[in-house]
């Protein structure tokens, strides 16, 4: 049986069940390499606290659809009295990047496990040239991930002193260009993640080849390699590379830019000081709030929650967005569907989709941006279930009583984008990260 | 690609104030930075002020900080230059500039131009 999601294949990959300390391991076409599951293992379940393996999912025991993967076991299990085997699910879902599989829940009997990811589209607009994961685990479980700095399009600039070379790079990912035909970046070659420009020529200095590490609690690695034979005549023989270090900061900054620190023989060494790289509980909320010890800021979004039916509405020229953030009321427009953002055609009332749903909420603070996401909703053709994106500008003289109003700013492939201006994303710091 | 038209540009006395203002068409708004761009004559293109299409953050050359203020209105795809104390060394003719790399402020890494404006600031 063919592999279902080729680009998937080349890594082993992780999730972690937090509240009950449980690290699983996932190789979703062939076997984890790891002895205590077995030679067959798929998934393999370590739970720390009684420090055992068990293989939860055995890679000859695979079943497929387009968007569901069962690996079964032969390890007997009891639910409600029935005999059933231990398995696990993953239910795939079309995103934008890669992404990473998510532990969901798990039964006495099955470990559920959601995956976001560009393998599960239907259309290839998302696929990259090359990409590899771009999360990881520290050694107290905590997931670090940088999913979120990967540019669909274009590229950071890495701050340089020599003003005759232009760095470029994207994050786990190659570079695409196609949206901006008229710049430098367009003399990139295809597949580079670091493209180094000299005058009017670009030249390939790394490719993603192995996923993001960690090598302390709060420092990153990613590595990126030349892979085409044929040195490039002003590396002075060596084979260009590239290692990006993402640094989590001590406490609570804005965002900066890519820093070159060394560069010798065409070997480029980057430092990124960046909240992504701190680890995602430091950034994220599934609630409208930010607050307590753990991240450094007070947040309150719940003000903002509208009641007794009413909806924030934004004008998006063909579509009106009505939006009802930080509550679980029904919008009238999109009864029945959940969504905390609902777009209607003004041309065609009946054609209502769902932009995000309210259960699929995350609030999150990262380099001094404030963005409340809403995912989950209605799909696209692409199979990309359509999501909005709300950034969140502190304004204390914000009108509709310091609430202020959504401004639509435009759709990326079915993504859709507000900006808010409003008191309540003034945001409090606290100094003891 | 995206396309830019400026306006706003004109004669002003030393001291005085103008709004620059860019409207863009075409591919959408959001996947690009801001630019704001000066030429004089006889002289290089040079940066005035950026502004990062997921936020609000800014960058400003020195010789303007203080004076001018890049905004936007996302509503209208409309891109401003508020230009405050106006000197004769701002006497340029002003671009509008859409770039997919981020945290650059290099003209050469700005795909997509509109035509500019004149600005003329008298003495």
């Known amino acids: 049986q063919a592999a279902p999601f080729p680009e998937l294949c080349s890594y082993t990959w992780e999730a972690v069940d937090t509240k009950n300390n449980v690290l699983y391991k996932i190789n979703i076409c062939g076997s984890v390499d790891i002895v205590q599951c077995g030679p067959s293992s798929a998934v393999c379940e370590h739970d720390l606290k009684t420090r055992t393996y068990h293989s939860v999912g055995d890679s000859v025991l695979r079943s497929a659809t387009r968007s569901l993967l069962e690996f079964n076991t032969t390890v007997s299990c009891d639910q409600q009295g029935t005999n059933h085997r231990v398995q696990s699910s993953i239910a795939f879902l079309c995103g934008k990047t890669l992404g990473t599989p998510e532990f969901v829940t798990a039964t006495e009997c099955v470990h559920y496990f959601e995956w976001r990811t560009t393998a599960a589209c239907k259309k290839d607009i998302f696929k990259a040239n090359k990409e590899v994961p771009c999360y990881v685990f520290d050694e107290e479980l905590r997931k670090h991930d940088l999913n979120p700095l990967i540019k669909l399009s274009g590229a950071y600039l890495v701050d340089d002193s020599d003003p005759d070379t232009s760095l470029f790079i994207n994050v786990c990912r190659d570079i695409d260009t196609l949206r901006d035909p008229g710049s430098q970046l367009r003399a990139c070659p295809p597949g580079t993640a670091a493209c180094l420009v000299r005058g009017h020529q670009a030249f390939d200095v790394g490719q993603p080849r192995d996923g993001l590490k960690v090598v302390r609690k709060d420092r990153l690695v990613l590595s990126y390699v030349r892979e085409e034979a044929g040195k490039l005549d002003f590396c002075d023989g060596h084979s260009p590379a590239v290692t990006i270090t993402f640094v989590c900061p001590s406490e609570r900054r804005e965002g900066t830019i890519p820093k070159l620190t060394a560069k010798s023989n065409c070997r480029y060494e980057i430092e990124w000081i960046t909240e992504y790289a701190c680890h995602r509980d430091y950034l994220e909320s599934k609630t409208c709030s930010l607050s307590g010890e753990q991240q450094d800021v007070s947040i309150d979004l719940t003000p903002l929650a509208q009641s007794g039916g009413s909806s924030y509405i934004s004008d998006g020229k063909e579509y009106l967005f009505y939006l009802n953030v930080c509550g679980e009321t029904e919008i009238q427009f999109c009864n029945k569907k959940q969504a905390a953002v609902c777009q209607v055609k003004k041309s065609d009332t009946s054609q209502v989709k769902a932009a995000g749903r309210y259960h699929n909420q995350t609030l999150r603070y990262s380099d001094g941006d404030l963005t409340l996401i809403y995912f989950g909703g209605d799909e696209c053709s692409s199979g990309f279930q359509r999501m909005s994106v709300i950034n969140f500008e502190c304004n204390k003289t914000a009108g509709n009583d310091g609430k202020g109003t959504p401004v639509f700013t435009g759709e990326v492939d079915c993504t859709y984008f507000f900006t808010w201006d409003t008191e309540y994303a003034c945001v409090h710091h606290h100094h003891h990260h | 690609q995206v396309q830019l038209q400026e306006s706003g540009g004109g004669l002003v006395q030393a001291g005085g104030s103008l709004r620059l203002s860019c409207e863009a068409s075409?591919?959408?708004?959001?996947?690009?930075?801001w630019g704001w761009f000066r030429q004089a004559p006889g002289k290089e293109r040079e940066f005035v002020a950026a502004?990062?299409?997921?936020?609000?953050?800014?960058s400003y050359a020195d010789s303007v900080k203080g004076r001018f203020t890049i905004s936007r209105d996302n509503a209208k795809n409309t891109i401003y230059l508020q230009m405050n104390s106006l000197k004769p060394e701002d006497t340029a003719v002003y671009y509008c500039?859409?770039?997919?790399?981020?945290?650059?402020?290099?003209?050469?890494?700005?795909?997509?131009w509109g035509q500019g404006t004149q600005v003329t600031v008298s003495s």
């Open positions: 500039a859409a770039s997919i790399v981020d945290f650059t402020t290099n003209p050469s890494h700005f795909g997509s």
């Open positions: 075409g591919r959408t708004f959001n996947t690009y930075n």
């Open positions: 502004i990062r299409w997921s936020s609000s953050k800014t």
